[in-house]
Structure formats: structure tokens, C-alpha cells
Amino acid sequence: TPEVWVQVQMEATELSSFTVHCGFLGPGSISLVTVSWGGPDGAGGTKLAVLHPELGTRQWAPARQARWETQSSISLALEDSGASSPFANTTFCCKFASFPEGSWESCGSLPPSSDPGLSAPPTPVPILRADHHHHHH
């Protein structure tokens, strides 16, 4: 079964900077990645970035830079402006779409005990409806 992992990392040198890393574990090619915060895509979450493997990336504040790391993983750098956007207590979600086969989404956050510079373990937090797009023709 395909799986999505999410890591949230606080930068050691700049405590206001965070990076979200997401990856897709499974067969098939990814056609679109959506990163949101505050909840899953379309369920209360606010989009931060969308990435297309050929057409490029789009991002919205407070996202600073979205990029592909591999064909199945992405990273998103964020700039925390302070109390107005407490990233340390925020859930980040990544949705990997493979049209028309399916889409898979998981969420993660910075562990409360994380030291700056240490990334969260890649423990997927699957969204229950993450496989609702499985199509078989």
C-alpha cells in the first residue's frame, strides 16, 4: 500500500525557519503534490504550496521555497513571523496525487521535545480517507 511520510524540521541557525519534508513510498509516478497547514487539503487546511513535476511550483506566504528533492519527495521552507504563526504547534499535511490512480495524504508536526536542528522521525500519520481516490479500470 502506498504511503506518505512527513518530517518537520526546525533550522538550528534560524529558529524562525522551518522546513517540511514529504515523500511518497509506493509505485507509480506523482502528478501533483499539495502542501497545507492547519489540517488536510480541503478539510480546514490552508494551502502553502503545490508542486508539479514538469510545470513547476507555486507557493503562498509564509512559504519561502518549495522544491522537488527527488521524483517522489519534496521540501518546503517556511519563514515563521513569530506569534502570529506558531509553526511549532502546527500540523503540516502533504498530499501526493497520481492521476487517475489515486491520491494519498499524511500529516505531521514538530515534536514538542525537538531540539533545534533535529528533524522529526518519519512517522506517517495517515488521514483516514487518504485512499478514497483509488481507481481501478
Epitope: 502528478s31 501533483l32 499539495t34 487539503d41 480541503g42 494551502k47 503545490v50 508539479h52 510545470l55 513547476g56 507555486r58 498530499k95 496525487a97 492521476f99 487517475p100 491520491s103 481516490h133
Partner: nanobody, 121 residues
Framework: DVQLVESGGGSVQAGGSLRLSCVAS????????MGWFRQAPGKEHEGVAH???????RYVDSVKGRFTISQDHAKNTLYLQMNSLKPEDSATYYC???????????????WGQGTQVTVSS
């Protein structure tokens, strides 16, 4: 996620017409575009038509003048009126919502289960 349910597919003779419908529930305006893709067996999927958030319809060249995409916002429904159908239009048609990276393409973020269109000669 937004839920998309298509209907209106079926079998028709070449030259005939079909009207596809797509009802969107839990629709949000977080995406840029809404439209129709199709995929025939053994072929790559292609974007047939979509409507931008500004209401501008866009079509792939092969359907221009034959297909018309429209929306009924009150019913949260998207339509695709298909006239002068050809055998090469046979495919599974998917309703999609997605994001724009250029004028001509609506990259799917969510989609329905699809509805089958078969055009015989």
C-alpha cells in the same frame, strides 16, 4: 477533499451528442480551475476542457467547436456538452478540480470516479 460525482456517460453513434455532469460536494475555492480529463485504454490521459477561476473556458484543440464546458454555481455542478462525437472521443471522462501552472493546463488535485463514453462508428 472535495467529492466529485460524474454522470451522463453512455454509448452513442458517431455524430451524436452526450452531456456529462459533475456534482461537487464540499467544494472549496482553494483551487484554480475545474474541468474534464479523459483517458482511453492504453493511452495517456489528456485535459479536454476546463474553466479558470475567472470563468474563462479553455479547450484542447481536438474538441474545439464540438464540446462546451459550463458551470452552474447554484448547483455546484460542472457540465460538458459533447456534440458531433467521434469514435476517438471514446474514453473514461473524469471531472477534476486543480491548479493552474499555465493557461492551457489544469493540474488535477481531486477527481471523481469517471464516467465511460463510447462512440461507435
Amino acid at each position: 477533499d472535495v467529492q466529485l460525482v460524474e454522470s451522463g456517460g453512455g454509448s452513442v453513434q458517431a455524430g451524436g451528442s452526450l452531456r456529462l455532469s459533475c456534482v461537487a460536494s464540499r467544494y472549496t475555492s482553494r483551487t484554480d480551475c475545474m474541468g474534464w480529463f479523459r483517458q482511453a485504454p492504453g493511452k495517456e490521459h489528456e485535459g479536454v476542457a476546463h474553466i479558470d477561476s475567472d470563468g474563462i473556458p479553455r479547450y484542447v484543440d481536438s474538441v474545439k467547436g464540438r464540446f462546451t464546458i459550463s458551470q452552474d454555481h447554484a448547483k455546484n455542478t460542472l457540465y460538458l456538452q459533447m456534440n458531433s462525437l467521434k469514435p476517438e472521443d471514446s474514453a473514461t471522462y473524469y471531472c477534476v478540480v486543480g491548479f493552474k501552472f499555465d493557461d492551457d493546463y489544469c493540474a488535477p488535485n481531486d477527481w471523481g470516479q469517471g464516467t465511460q463514453v463510447t462512440v461507435s462508428s
